[in-house]
Interface confidence: low
């Protein structure tokens, strides 16, 4: 089928970076400035993405590939292909509609993005708090007093970092 189509359709011979120009007897014409075609056989070229405002250019547009954007310092990308930029906060804060706000007591955020999450409840695992939590750091759980017999391990390493937005189970 592909071979048959290429015999019938001269446009299928147009490579990426060109378009099949109906106004010129289906000649393969280069994409105009600020446009691209990433696949062959295109009848039009797509307009290049323009990175403006809070978006800055990570990769320039070429005749065969679209521009790629990232976010200006103080912001981070969200969404497929960095479709949005979200404001960074400091560790110990979360982003609210009124800007960056400190984590409430009993919660922490160790990143510049995401939400404040509750401190680990050590007692659920039968442990005690070895190091108190802060706005920036989770508590460190240690052994319960009963576990502090000779030869017992004195510190339980902190649990692996959770994904932002996921509260402890």
């Amino acid at each position: 089928f592909e071979r048959t189509r290429s015999l019938q359709d001269p446009c299928s011979n147009c490579p990426a970076g060109t378009f099949c120009d109906n106004n010129r007897n289906q000649i393969c014409s280069p994409c105009p400035p600020n446009s691209f075609s990433s696949a062959g056989g295109q009848r039009t070229c797509d307009i290049c993405r323009q990175c403006k405002g809070v978006f800055r250019t990570r990769k320039e547009c070429s005749s065969t590939s679209n521009a790629e954007c990232d976010c200006t310092p103080g912001f981070h990308c969200l969404g497929a292909g960095c479709s949005m930029c979200e404001q960074d906060c400091k560790q110990g804060q979360e982003l609210t509609k009124k800007g960056c706000k400190d984590c409430c007591f009993g919660t922490f955020n160790d990143q510049k993005r995401g939400i404040c999450r509750p401190w680990t409840n050590c007692s659920l695992d039968g442990k005690s708090v070895l190091v108190n939590g802060t706005k920036e750091r989770d508590v460190v759980c240690g052994p319960s007093p009963a576990d502090l017999s000779p030869g017992a391990s004195s510190v339980t390493p902190p649990a692996p970092a959770r994904e932002p937005g996921h509260s402890p189970q």
Partner: nanobody
């Protein structure tokens, strides 16, 4: 599609005032938080202020607090920035931007104006 057009920039002496406007079209203006940003020559983008959809919640960057006032007129699909006591360091291109309604402090890719230049110089 979303269109934001800023106006009102120009040359002003230190201590002077300007009022920037941002005309919005292509979306339901009254549903969205709106922001002003600025970019000084050779510097990064700086958030200036934002305003909630109803206008009841407003916040400012420390650098402009007490001098700039953000406002909006939902009936006219317009956002404003009244700038008083202007200083040389306020010289920048000023942009209005639409915030994503689902994600606080987040700016959509398509939601930017082209900017208006404010120059503060004697």
């Amino acid at each position: 599609q979303v269109q934001l057009v800023e106006s009102g920039g120009g040359l002003v002496k230190p201590g002077g005032s300007l009022r920037l406007s941002c005309a919005a079209s292509g979306f339901i203006f009254s549903d969205y938080y709106m922001s002003w940003f600025r970019q000084a020559p050779g510097k990064g983008l700086e958030w200036v202020s934002h305003i909630s959809s109803s206008g009841s919640s407003i916040d400012y960057a420390d650098s402009v607090k007490g001098r700039f006032t953000i406002s909006r007129d939902n009936a006219k699909n317009s956002l404003y920035l009244q700038m008083n006591s202007l200083r040389a360091e306020d010289t920048a291109v000023y942009y209005c931007a639409r915030e994503d309604p689902r994600l606080s402090g987040t700016i959509d890719f398509d939601s930017w104006g082209q900017g208006t230049l404010v120059t503060v110089s004697s």
